[in-house]
């Protein structure tokens, strides 16, 4: 958890509560759900539904939970331990790409090409050539058919903290 | 981007005063420590103190205690090293850095860095 922090990743500031939970770190390390004492001594307990940490750590907060933006669904809550987990609604999909945003799946497959995957939340419809079996690249066609699909909507996490 | 700017460094006599300042942006994280480190010619990074800015803790080498002064202005976001009774082992290039890890002494806790500046201790 030390490497690949960003700024924006971390909580508002904030002192830690009387009702915090406190223990004793660990050569030098709390456990995940807590963060470190400025002087090193204490493990003080994340804020459930606000921050967490998923691993050992000697930080001096917890990392801020994610929200979920609109156009998501959110599959689990943030707890001390675990980031929320958020994803697509039905009919939009996330790629690899472009992370930050739901993008809507296509209705239909261009001309010459049927459907062999449906739209799930981390996939658009995937389209193939009739003949060769050849994938399509997945630029939205000048002209589609009118070949729909049913949206999928298996579970899939949009953003892990593992 | 996290920048940090060190200036006050000089010559001074032996049992003078100086003070460094630390100019320190970009910084967003809600808690972390500042600290100042050396590196005396031909030798290593040495810890000198470190201030934390959520609780104000402040740690200090052996070497320095009683003689150094580690404060902090939180509204310029800049820290300070007020020295006295300096030696000519205190000569050095001072370092400003900032951790987000507590209890931190060791280099290796520091993510940010700054250029340094140079005091120099002679008669």
């Known amino acids: 958890e030390s490497a690949l922090i960003t700024q924006q990743d971390l909580a508002p500031q904030q002192r830690a509560a009387p009702q915090q939970k406190r223990s004793s770190p660990s050569e030098g390390l709390c456990p995940p759900g807590h963060h470190i004492s400025e002087d090193g001594r204490d493990c003080i307990s994340c804020k459930y539904g606000q921050d967490y940490s998923t691993h050992w750590n000697d930080l001096l907060f917890c990392l801020r939970c994610t929200r979920c933006d609109s156009g998501e669904v959110e599959l689990s809550p943030c707890t001390t331990t675990r980031n929320t987990v958020c994803q697509c609604e039905e009919g939009t999909f996330r790629e690899e790409d472009s992370p930050e945003m739901c993008r809507k799946c296509r209705t239909g497959c261009p001309r010459g090409m049927v459907k062999v995957g449906d739209c799930t939340p981390w996939s658009d419809i995937e389209c193939v050539h009739k003949e060769s079996g050849t994938k399509h690249s997945g630029e939205v066609p000048a002209v589609e058919e009118t070949v729909t699909s049913s949206p999928g909507t298996p579970a899939s996490p949009c953003s892990l903290s593992g | 981007e996290v920048q940090l700017l060190e200036s006050g460094g000089g010559e001074v006599q032996p049992g003078g005063s100086l003070r460094l300042s630390c100019a320190a942006s970009g910084l967003t994280f809600p808690n972390y420590g500042m600290s100042w480190f050396r590196q005396a010619p031909g030798k290593g990074l040495e810890f000198v103190c470190a201030i934390y800015w959520s609780g104000g803790t402040v740690y200090y080498a052996e070497s320095v205690k009683g003689r150094f002064t580690c404060s902090r202005d939180n509204a310029k976001n800049t820290l300070y090293l007020q020295m006295s009774s300096l030696r000519a082992e205190d000569t050095a290039v001072y370092y400003c850095?900032?951790?987000?890890?507590?209890?931190?002494?060791?280099?290796?806790?520091?993510?940010?860095w700054g250029q340094g500046t140079l005091v120099t201790v002679k008669p």
């Open positions: 850095a900032v951790t987000i890890r507590g209890a931190a002494t060791q280099t290796w806790k520091y993510d940010y």
